[in-house]
């Protein structure tokens, strides 16, 4: 991974593009920290394992987060 101690935040660019929850392998929400002062959302896609940084402020991404948490709550007993 191209990472050095000087890299503070993971995302170089962020995407507003809606993501189909069915095409998601994993959704990571990285809270703000001493290294990166903002929340970062990283979607791992099933196709080729592509990772995409998402815009936490985007309406489409907020809807995605709701859909994913709803799906998780359905699955948990």
């Amino acid at each position: 991974v191209p990472l050095s101690r000087t890299v503070r935040c993971t995302c170089i660019s962020i995407s507003n593009q809606p993501v189909n929850p069915r095409s998601l392998e994993k959704l990571e929400i990285i809270p703000a920290s001493q290294f990166c002062p903002r929340v970062e959302i990283i979607a791992t896609m099933k196709k080729k394992g592509e990772k995409r940084c998402l815009n936490p402020e985007s309406k489409a991404i907020k809807n995605l987060l709701k859909a994913v948490s709803k799906e998780r709550s359905k699955r948990s007993p």
Partner: antibody, heavy 124, light 109 residues
Framework: QMQLVESGGGVVQPGRSLRLSCTAS????????MHWVRQAPGKGLEWVAV????????FYVDSVKGRFTISRDNSKNTLYLEMNSLRAEDTAIYYC?????????????????WGQGTTVTVGG | EIVLTQSPGTLSLSPGERATLSCRAS???????LAWYQQKPGQAPRLLIY???SRATGIPDRFSGSGSGTDFTLTISRLEPEDFAVYYC??????????FGPGTKVDIK
């Protein structure tokens, strides 16, 4: 459509300074990392600098460290390259380029939009 | 620092022929970090391939990328007149820096 327009190039004496600008349109500039890439006459491409979408990180090729500064003003949709202590070997076409949507340190989507470049000539 | 080497330096082919361009890295590169660009004289570069094998938006399917580790390939299945240009591979490496190869010129035989 997505467009980048560079300006600020010109002829400058060695040791002097120049500021390049790159104005973006047709996309949400504040969402994308941005790069400067240069091409010396008759030579290949050389990456110069990158800035994260929010300015949080900036990185440079070794040959310009301490002399060049990349910055951005998201309210003006503009990217800058401040070039100090210019040398003859800095003579090149300077392109600004957009980092692809969603790129991060774990996956790279390439430089997907480029300007037409602005020419910097150092020397007489 | 990873160095990229491209071969051949020049490839002389006729329209309709297949072009195979090679990009070799001095150390292993994750395919997630490898891109290819096309540049025509007097024009800015254009992104063709990212992630070693994914075509960028609007790129015709005659362009394909493959490879892993230290060896990557750009293939143009049937050369069109507009494909004669210089092709650069590029990698995103630690620090982070973004290194270009020296380029391969594809010219008309």
């Amino acid at each position: 459509q997505m467009q980048l327009v560079e300006s600020g190039g010109g002829v400058v004496q060695p040791g002097r300074s120049l500021r390049l600008s790159c104005t973006a349109s047709g996309f949400t500039f504040s969402n994308n990392g941005m790069h400067w890439v240069r091409q010396a006459p008759g030579k290949g491409l050389e990456w110069v600098a990158v800035i994260w979408f929010d300015g949080m990180n900036k990185f440079y090729v070794d040959s310009v460290k301490g002399r060049f500064t990349i910055s951005r003003d998201n309210s003006k949709n503009t990217l800058y390259l401040e070039m100090n202590s210019l040398r003859a070997e800095d003579t090149a076409i300077y392109y600004c380029a957009r980092e692809g949507d969603g790129s991060g340190i774990y996956y790279y989507y390439g430089m997907d939009v480029w300007g037409q470049g602005t020419t910097v000539t150092v020397g007489g | 620092e990873i160095v990229l080497t491209q071969s051949p330096g020049t490839l002389s082919l006729s329209p309709g022929e297949r072009a195979t361009l090679s990009c070799r890295a001095s150390q292993s590169v994750s395919s997630s970090y490898l891109a290819w660009y096309q540049q025509k004289p007097g024009q800015a570069p254009r992104l063709l391939i990212y992630g070693a094998s994914s075509r960028a938006t609007g790129i015709p399917d005659r362009f394909s990328g493959s490879g892993s580790g230290t060896d990557f390939t750009l293939t143009i299945s049937r050369l069109e007149p507009e494909d004669f240009a210089v092709y650069y591979c590029q990698q995103y490496g630690s620090s982070p820096i973004f290194t270009f190869g020296p380029g391969t010129k594809v010219d008309i035989k």
